[in-house]
């Protein structure tokens, strides 16, 4: 049975270039090890934005230099992407893999379109 992954269709980044969204998956089994990957799709090219593996019940930890942070609660992951600029506007796909125990399951969301608007520079003041 396929694993369903749900994520919002659209998110608007804050003026500070921060975007948050929830990625929720319907687990077909009792996974203890889950890997979550955020992918960016642009012009049919897919690249990895960030990824984290976590044990169920433990916190989600991205690498120190990652632009992502997140928290997990059951089958729900709250993802935050930082440092976004207008050129980063695009489709961000949440990918979930149930790594352990067997069987392995793959779940791919439909993607969240993140819109990023660069803030207007402050006018010079005399």
């Amino acid at each position: 049975k396929a694993m369903h992954v749900a994520q919002p269709a659209v998110v608007l980044a804050s003026s500070r270039g921060i975007a948050s969204f929830v990625c929720e998956y319907a687990s077909p089994g009792k996974a203890t090890e889950v890997r979550v990957t955020v992918l960016r799709q642009a012009d049919s090219q897919v690249t990895e934005v960030c990824a984290a593996t976590y044990m169920m019940g433990n916190e989600l930890t991205f690498l120190d230099d990652s632009i992502c942070t997140g928290t997990s609660s059951g089958n729900q992951v709250n993802l935050t992407i930082q440092g976004l600029r207008a050129m980063d506007t695009g489709l961000y796909i949440c990918k979930v893999e149930l790594m352990y125990p067997p069987p392995y399951y793959l779940g791919i969301g439909n993607g969240t379109q993140i819109y990023v608007i660069d803030p207007e520079p402050c006018p010079d003041s005399d």
Epitope: K1, A2, M3, H4, P28, E33, R35, T37, L39, V46, T47, E48, I93, K95, M99, Y100, P102, P103, Y104, Y105, L106, G107, I108
Partner: antibody, heavy 118, light 108 residues
Amino acid sequence: QVQLVESGGGVVQPGRSLRLSCAASGFTFSSYHMHWVRQAPGKGLEWVTFISYDGNNKYYADSVKGRFTISRDNSKNTLYLQMNSLRAEDTAIYYCARTGWLGPFDYWGQGTLVTVSS
Amino acid sequence: EIVLTQSPGTLSLSPGERATLSCRASQSVGSSYLAWYQQKPGQAPRLLIYGAFSRATGIPDRFSGSGSGTDFTLTISRLEPEDFAVYYCQQYGSSPWTFGQGTKVEIK
């Protein structure tokens, strides 16, 4: 460009062992899950085994479980398949394949032929 | 284990004709997790379609995929001489990863 090059195939007697290698280049090997897939002469494709990007998770087809071991050395950009207790039915071309970001096997090596015969 | 059954086993067609290949799964496969591969004699398989209908990089638009649930189709709108090969469907949504037995598209 992405390249996968298998080596280590050959003729081996039943019950003996063989180790296959797959040298990867043109991409960040340590970020990708990898597979071995085989194809018996004149037959279809059969998935053999999977290893996660970091080597911590491995899965095997029932037909090879307990006899084959998949491993990887990310510092050498190389994938391995240790095949023990080989049988005639293991005779096949063995391909290594990369898992693309969205799941399909997006790049394949050219394959290496393993013949198990007395 | 998800069993994939392809039909027909062999398809005999002429260049320029339309080819329709079928892949049926023993249980539901999400459309995000169905791929098609092409294999020519002496060569490794090549990814054509993933996610049931997305073309892989460099694949011409005469190749298209469709379907959902348990029934999937690969269509080649106008066969070119280089399209005569064996085609495999595959599911990659859960282990064990499985392939169909293949459909050979041969010149009539």
